[in-house]
Interface confidence: medium
């Protein structure tokens, strides 16, 4: 499977909410011997590989924000911890996988990565990630609502497997 990032750039005004989205593409195993670990984190565009560094989002680590479930289940993060930080990560039955950030500030600007790990019973795994940029703007040049910019076809299927 692959991870698609429908939008590579989100430009939002300060104080607005935004939902960053990734989507699983291709066949997804739904057996009992597989579990999916999905999460979000901030990163930097590394020289070797984008998304290799896993930084917290609003002080929540990728482990705080993780979802884990079998192939056929939907999931949400721990509401209390995430919502205290104005965050909510969610996943549905159709492969969509998102993080919502409320009341954006300039400090939220940066590179965001979604990570999906398909973990198998017999000690194998498959990792894919997607990357997108969030720009939070203030002042007269800021848009009134979030503006999203579609990924190019190359970007939208940003795949890295372990």
């Amino acid at each position: 499977f692959k991870v698609a990032t429908p939008y590579s750039l989100y430009v939002c005004p300060e104080g607005q909410n935004v939902t960053l989205t990734c989507r699983l593409l291709g066949p997804v195993d739904k057996g009992h011997d597989v579990t999916f670990y999905k999460t979000w984190y901030r990163s930097s565009r590394g020289e070797v590989q984008t998304c290799s560094e896993r930084r917290p989002i609003r002080n929540l680590t990728f482990q705080d924000l993780h979802l884990h479930h079998g192939g056929h289940q939907a999931a949400n993060t721990s509401h209390d911890l995430a919502q205290r930080h104005g965050l909510e990560s969610a996943s549905d039955h159709h492969g969509n996988f998102s993080i919502t950030m409320r009341n954006l500030t300039l400090l939220d600007s940066g590179l965001y990565c979604c990570l999906v790990v398909e973990i198998r019973h017999h000690h194998s795994e498959h990792r894919v990630h997607g990357a997108m940029e969030l720009q939070v703007q203030t002042g007269k040049d800021a848009p009134s609502n979030c503006v999203v910019y579609p990924s190019s076809s190359q970007d939208s299927e940003n795949i890295t497997a372990a």
Epitope: D33, T35, Y37, T39, G46, V48, Q49, S52, E53, R54, F62, Q63, H66, H68, L115, V117, I119, H121, H122, H123, S124, E125, R127, A162
Partner: antibody, heavy 120, light 107 residues
């Protein structure tokens, strides 16, 4: 904050078995791999095996295959390592450590270690 | 199994020195390389993951680089609390393997 707390030191006779526990708190237990790593006196680190609790099956280093059993109890968030047919060269500090993601990743949280002494 | 070879096995340095430790894998492991620090009587502590990413809470004087088979841990300005043993570990695939360690001692 994640914490791994291991059981206390053990003194064992050659040929016997030892079972060391590792209780996790402060985070999700089931979906993270736990590995066991040992360190003989004055020596380096040696990976013995690992388990992801939701799956229940463990993966072992060839050297320990057949002699080590790694299990996990999701209800108590505890992982166990049992080593049988002990010999003097098994005298070591045994650590449990949690992987950050999946089966193969960095070991970001470690237990305090359990000294197992094998002596007649 | 993937063999990990560290060099040197020990080194003597002074506070303020720049220290470099190398680790070589017997086959390509991409950037699946981690570095740990261990002090006597304590559990290892993760310093660097994915070859070059600094673990949260680790001072910025520690840095890692490399990919494929050759990797480096650098301490830009050695501090008194940095005297310890350092291990590399490959996280490319099972069995997980560690380097034999590099002991950093006070000159």
């Amino acid at each position: 904050q994640v914490q791994l707390v291991q059981s206390g030191a053990e003194v064992k006779k050659p040929g016997s078995s030892v079972k060391v526990s590792c209780k996790a708190s402060g985070g999700t237990f089931s979906s993270y791999a736990i590995s066991w790593v040992r360190q003989a006196p004055g020596q380096g680190l040696e990976w013995m095996g690992g388990i992801i609790p939701i799956f229940g099956t463990a993966n072992y280093a060839q050297k320990f295959q057949g002699r080590v059993t790694i299990t996990a109890d999701e209800s108590t968030s505890t992982a166990y390592m049992e080593l049988s047919s002990l010999r003097s060269e098994d005298t070591a500090v045994y650590y449990c450590a949690r992987h950050s993601i999946g089966w193969v990743a960095e070991l970001d949280y470690w237990g305090q270690g359990t000294l197992v002494t094998v002596s007649s | 199994d993937i063999q990990m070879t560290q060099s040197p096995s020990s080194l003597s340095a002074s506070v303020g020195d720049r220290v470099t430790i190398t680790c070589r894998a017997s086959q390509s492991i991409a950037t699946d390389l981690n570095w740990y620090q261990q002090k006597p009587g304590k559990a290892p502590k993760l310093l660097i993951y994915a070859a070059s990413s600094l673990q949260s809470g680790v001072p910025s004087r520690f840095s890692g680089s490399g990919s494929g088979t050759d990797f480096t841990l650098t301490i830009s300005s050695l501090q008194p609390e940095d005297f310890a043993t350092y291990y590399c570990q490959q996280a490319h695939w099972y069995p997980l393997t560690f380097g034999q360690g590099t002991k950093v001692e006070i000159k």
